[in-house]
């Protein structure tokens, strides 16, 4: 035990009085701390710490996990320690598998031994693989094995602590070494665009890309000659182990003229710093002017093609262009391109190609274009001339015959009655009711006409023709009556009569 000068506080005395103690698993650990000012026992192994206020530390049945440093401390803060090994052939190592190492620094593989008398305490690669040739280590049974000067190449290295016991090699659980790289160069910085010209009120957004070996690189946007903190948003990615990328996006949601100036993206690490700049010039309000290249009212025949073409001036550059029909946006069939490839070009062309137009495709086609200041639109009214289509031809519950036709221009419906089996229907019948229907349902872009006549007027077998016609053409449908006693019966139209 250490000796001290009289009058000075002395460290506590521990029994047994040796620095190391080896016990077998299952045996008793009995440690006595003698000191008039005894405060506590402390047990430490790996990250575990236990305390005991009794001056005698007793562990009745020792386990491998009781291996560690037992320290007795007195009220003067003086202490004495004994290291206890609990020899357990089934558990030669205590392990903390977390293993991080900073590049070029030493790191400890924490696999202290429970038996100091085993031999060849060392590191081995997993699955029999050899360790890197330049990997050096220093074993310490009480702490683990220190890897000297960690290299970046050791990242994700799989290791075991190893000892020889009775001539056989015994391995610990595996460790995976995670290497934190050291900075050996300044960050690499780049900017999405070197200069911006914006209209007042437009959003200014610029992205700086910072590349380095790890995420602990520092970066910020600064405004030259200003201390104002700028609003930034970050996205980051790890492309492999030591290839980190951050995108720092600076946004001024509504730029003003006095926001003009030079903005610097600055980054630094422990090795040094780097920066890149972008210039913002804000001028006042933008504009869009649209010029139709064809008449905005278009008549086209069913099945024909038509191209809707506009030219427009836009500054700043147009951000969104779309052609819309019936609240639906075209995803194809249109193209939008600058009138010239000149950097300062502000004139553009947009073309919508409508092919083989159907009667259901008439209506308003709208071109919309916007930049951050202005929205502009122009509408083309497209009328598709279509031969009438007879949608329905029904005898109603109330005895009416109803014929519904659609077409453009608006169809006219005439009614004819042919008595018996005559092939020509010439006797015209006046309708009881004619309505132009709301065409919100199918079909859109055509005009829908509904006409009704009273079928009770027909007292003899015959055929009723509904004829719908307009400037484009005509269509007929036929309804046949046959009387059985006092009952009027509908007969298959196509079996009795071929128009």
């Amino acid at each position: 035990q250490p000796s001290v000068s009289p009058g000075e506080p002395s460290p506590p005395s521990i029994h047994p009085g040796k620095s190391d103690l080896i016990v077998r698993v299952g045996d008793e650990i009995r440690l006595l701390c003698t000191d008039p000012g005894f405060v506590k026992w402390t047990f430490e192994i790996l990250d575990e710490t236990n305390e005991n206020k009794q001056n005698e530390w007793i562990t009745e049945k020792a386990e491998a996990t009781n291996t560690g440093k037992y320290t007795c401390t007195n009220k003067h803060g003086l202490s004495n320690s004994i290291y206890v090994f609990v020899r357990d052939p089934a558990k030669l190592f205590l392990v903390d598998r977390s293993l991080y190492g900073k590049e070029d620094n030493d790191t400890l593989v924490r696999c202290p031994l429970t038996d100091p008398e085993v031999t060849n305490y060392s590191l081995k690669g997993c699955q029999g693989k050899p360790l890197p040739k330049d990997l050096r280590f220093i074993p310490d049974p009480k702490a683990g094995i220190m890897i000297k000067s960690v290299k970046r190449a050791y990242h994700r290295l799989c290791l075991h602590c190893s000892v020889d016991q009775e001539g056989k090699s015994v391995l610990s659980e595996k460790f995976i070494l995670k290497v934190r790289p050291a900075f050996k160069a300044v960050p690499v910085v780049s900017v999405s665009k070197a200069s911006y010209l914006l209209r007042e009120g437009e959003e200014f957004t610029v992205t700086c890309t910072i590349k380095d070996v790890s995420s602990s690189v520092y970066s910020t946007w600064k405004r030259e000659n200003s201390q104002t903190k700028l609003q930034e948003k970050y996205n980051s990615w790890h492309h492999g182990d030591f290839n980190y990328e951050r995108q720092a996006t600076l946004t001024i949601s509504s730029a003003r003229v006095n926001d003009s100036g030079v903005f610097m993206c600055y980054a630094n690490n422990t090795f040094g710093s780097a920066n890149v700049t972008t210039t913002l010039e804000v001028v006042d309000k933008g504009f869009i002017n649209i010029f139709p290249m064809i008449n905005t009212t278009v008549f086209v025949n069913d099945g024909e093609n038509v191209d809707l073409i506009v030219e427009y001036e836009a500054f700043p550059k147009p951000e969104h262009q779309q052609w819309i029909y019936m609240n639906r946006t075209f995803t194809d069939k249109w193209e939008d391109y600058p009138k010239s490839e000149n950097e300062s070009n502000i004139r553009y062309v947009s073309e919508l190609h409508l092919t083989r137009l159907k009667g259901t495709e008439g209506g308003t086609y709208t071109f919309l274009v916007s930049n951050s200041d202005v929205n502009a639109a122009i509408a083309f009214n497209v009328y598709v001339n279509t031969k009438p289509e007879i949608l329905t031809y029904d005898r109603l519950v109330n005895g009416m015959l109803q014929c519904v036709a659609a077409g453009f221009p608006e169809p006219t419906i005439d009614w004819y009655f042919c008595p018996g089996t005559e092939q020509r229907c010439s006797a015209s019948v006046l309708p009881v009711d004619v309505q132009t229907l709301n065409s919100s349902g199918p079909p859109f872009g055509k005009l829908v006409v509904q006409s009704s006549i009273d079928s009770s007027a027909f007292k003899h077998n015959g055929t009723v023709e509904c004829k719908a016609y307009n400037d484009v053409g005509k269509t007929s449908a036929y309804f046949n009556f046959a009387f059985k006693g006092n009952n009027k019966e509908q007969i298959h139209p196509h079996t009795l009569f071929t128009p």
Epitope: I390, G441, A477, Q490, P493
Partner: antibody, heavy 122, light 108 residues
């Protein structure tokens, strides 16, 4: 006599496409609107689409609008249904059917094909 | 469905059975009726006020009252066991037609 014969249906994965055809005979094909109606296994009939007698107009059930296209070739007396972006719920027997009234698009269906099974499954 | 049918109906052989279909559009428009036997295509049996396509026996008849259409089979036969679907305009103002959910007729 009137005959409507659908092509063999088949199995398709969700998101894929399939094309059905229906060969017509025994009537003046070009004078009548033609419909597709489907029936999911163990379920009722559901109208799918119609094309007018000359093919110039088409109408669709909301459940297939934008995914299915009905068409006809009057020179070949054949009706088609192009089915894109198929979903599991499109699994059904598909029938082609003839409109009863000449020249009228919507109305009763007096002749039906034998039906063809389309299975959409991954 | 905008047209509502009872899921199942049964009838003794030779007796009369009525299958009904309800829907707003039936106040103005007649329903047509389709018969479908297992593994077969539907067959039109009644259309219009009460018309039968050729080949349909006269024991099948149709009628209409208010918002209800009915298919009546007078003297049901074993071969009449099938699913029956009504069909009419939808009630939304379009010209599309809709089917009822179908009624399974069992002949005992």
């Amino acid at each position: 006599q009137v005959q409507l014969v659908e092509s063999w249906g088949g199995v398709a994965q969700p998101g894929r496409s399939l094309r059905l055809s229906c060969a017509a005979s025994g009537f003046t094909f070009s004078s009548f609107a033609m419909h597709w109606v489907r029936q999911a296994p163990g379920k009722g009939l559901e109208w799918v689409a119609v094309t007018s007698y000359d093919g110039s107009n088409e109408y669709y059930a909301d459940s297939v609008k934008g995914r299915f296209t009905i068409s006809r070739d009057n020179s070949k007396n054949t009706l088609y249904l192009q089915m894109n972006s198929l979903r599991a719920e499109d699994t059904a027997v598909y029938y082609c059917a003839k409109a009863m009234v000449r020249g009228v698009t919507f109305g009763d269906l007096d002749y039906w094909g034998q039906g063809t099974l389309v299975t959409v499954s991954s | 469905s905008e047209l509502t049918q009872d899921p199942a109906v049964s009838v003794a052989l030779g007796q009369t059975v009525r299958i009904t279909c309800q829907g707003d559009s039936l106040r103005s428009y007649y329903a047509s009726w389709y018969q479908q036997k297992p593994e077969q295509a539907p067959v039109l049996v009644i259309y219009g006020e009460n018309s039968r396509p050729s080949g349909i026996p006269d024991r099948f008849s149709g009628s209409s009252s208010g918002n209800t259409a009915s298919l009546t089979i007078t003297g049901a036969q074993a071969e009449d066991e099938a699913d029956y679907y009504c069909n009419s305009r939808d009630s939304s103002g379009t010209h599309l037609r809709v089917f009822g959910g179908g009624t399974k007729l069992t002949v005992l």
